[in-house]
């Protein structure tokens, strides 16, 4: 875990400025865990951050992530009805100036330090159709989701909407 007091003292002020000209509609500081209740943790190793999926000890504090939610219009499908859909996109930041990024070439999820405007690789389409879990689809690669593979986060291709209930791409958000 970070062990940085700034993580716990994270405030909205850090993310008040607009991203790609759009301000978040809301922000939420939450711990992220897998469908099977393993925690997503972040550790500083050799001057870069690593992301782990692990069982925490009983009283170990969970790392928090700031989720910033954005509205995005996307074009209608081939139905020809001409109506745009409104979807939610999210960025995930576990500490100041660092955001989760999709590395589509390596099929990996990485923490990158970057300035605003954030690149498209930092944006994920939010899905929460599976009861009270969420999943994160790459903006840059539709059909590819953040998932769990070998105790790490990875990018996982999902073939159809029926497979959105696959446990390894489902995550839980919690204030505690």
């Amino acid at each position: 875990a970070f062990g940085i007091s700034g993580v716990q003292k994270y405030t909205r002020a850090l993310h008040d400025s607009s991203i790609t000209g759009i301000s978040p509609i809301t922000e939420y500081l939450a711990s992220l865990s897998t469908y099977n209740d393993q925690s997503i943790t972040f550790a500083l190793e050799d001057e870069s951050y690593e992301i782990y999926v692990e069982d925490l000890k009983k009283d170990e504090k969970k790392d928090k992530v700031l989720l910033s939610y954005y509205e995005s219009q996307h074009p209608s499908n081939e139905s020809g009805d001409g109506v745009d859909g409104k979807m939610l996109m999210v960025t995930l930041s576990p500490t100041k100036d660092f955001w989760l990024h999709a590395n589509n070439k390596e099929h990996s999820v990485e923490l990158h330090k970057c300035e605003k405007p954030l690149p498209d690789q930092a944006f994920f389409v939010l899905h929460n159709m599976h009861s009270n879990c969420v999943s994160f689809e790459c903006k840059t690669d539709p059909g590819v989701f953040i998932g769990v593979k070998d105790n790490h986060l990875a990018l996982i291709k999902v073939d159809s909407s029926e497979n959105l209930c696959t446990e390894n791409i489902l995550f839980k958000l919690s204030e505690t």
């Epitope: 509609i25 809301t26 996307h74 499908n77 979807m87 389409v125 929460n128 009861s131 909407s161 959105l164």
Partner: antibody, heavy 122, light 107 residues
């Protein structure tokens, strides 16, 4: 114009069944989760059930679990609610309602139908 | 389940008045709260979503705020067409739940 039109309501005896329909137009129906919400006479709103855009996820209020079934036919832009083992307390106006966001429940219901009345009485 | 408690259950006000309705959740959640207006005999209409986002076409006199457990709908200057019943709804987790409603009546 974005529109939802319910049909199928009526008078039914306790223990009986009914099938409600909701016809959607003006938006990409398959992209959105859909809901049924009811309102008993003189009472407030009660969420009943929801279904994801693909139809793969369905969710129910405890009060109707095991008795009501939600389904959809995306090829016909239609939403359905099968009501079985009806009770007097199921008497209400039933509304179908569209989610604000594609692929997410978070935004509430931005489009509502006009409602269809279901009366359960002997 | 998240219970939503609205207050007051009814309020008498005059045209031009400022009206405030509150909604309290039994447990804290993010900002996924919606407000609806319902005129008797009509379907509900979405006013506010994500706690503070004004739905397209809704007059700016309606304002939503709050997060966690406490949310507020404010009508800055009541108009004749605003006399109706207002409901909050949490859209955070299943089962989705509504508040009991607040009836805004003419004084």
């Amino acid at each position: 114009e974005v529109q939802l039109v319910e049909s199928g309501g009526g008078l039914v005896q306790p223990g009986g069944s009914l099938r409600l329909s909701c016809s959607a137009s003006g938006f990409t129906f398959s992209s959105y989760a859909m809901n049924w919400v009811r309102q008993a006479p003189g009472k407030g709103l009660e969420w009943v059930t929801a279904i994801s855009g693909s139809g793969g996820g369905t969710y129910y209020a405890d009060s109707v679990k095991g008795r009501f079934t939600i389904s959809r036919d995306n090829s016909k832009n239609s939403l359905f609610l099968q009501l079985n083992s009806l009770r007097a307390e199921d008497t209400a106006v039933y509304y179908c309602a569209k989610q604000t966001y594609t692929s997410s429940w978070y935004g509430g219901f931005d489009i509502w139908g006009q409602g269809t009345m279901v009366t359960v009485s002997s | 389940d998240i219970q939503m408690t609205q207050s007051p259950s009814s309020v008498s006000a005059s045209v031009g008045d400022r009206v405030t309705i509150t909604c309290r959740a039994s447990q804290g959640f993010s900002s996924w709260l919606a407000w609806y207006q319902q005129i008797p005999g009509k379907a509900p209409k979405l006013l506010i979503y994500a706690a503070s986002r004004l739905q397209s076409g809704v007059p700016s006199r309606f304002r939503g705020s709050g997060s966690g457990t406490d949310f507020t709908l404010t009508i800055s200057s009541l108009q004749p067409e605003d006399f109706a019943t207002y409901y909050c709804q949490q859209a955070n987790s299943f089962p989705l739940t509504f508040g009991g409603g607040t009836k805004v009546e003419i004084k």
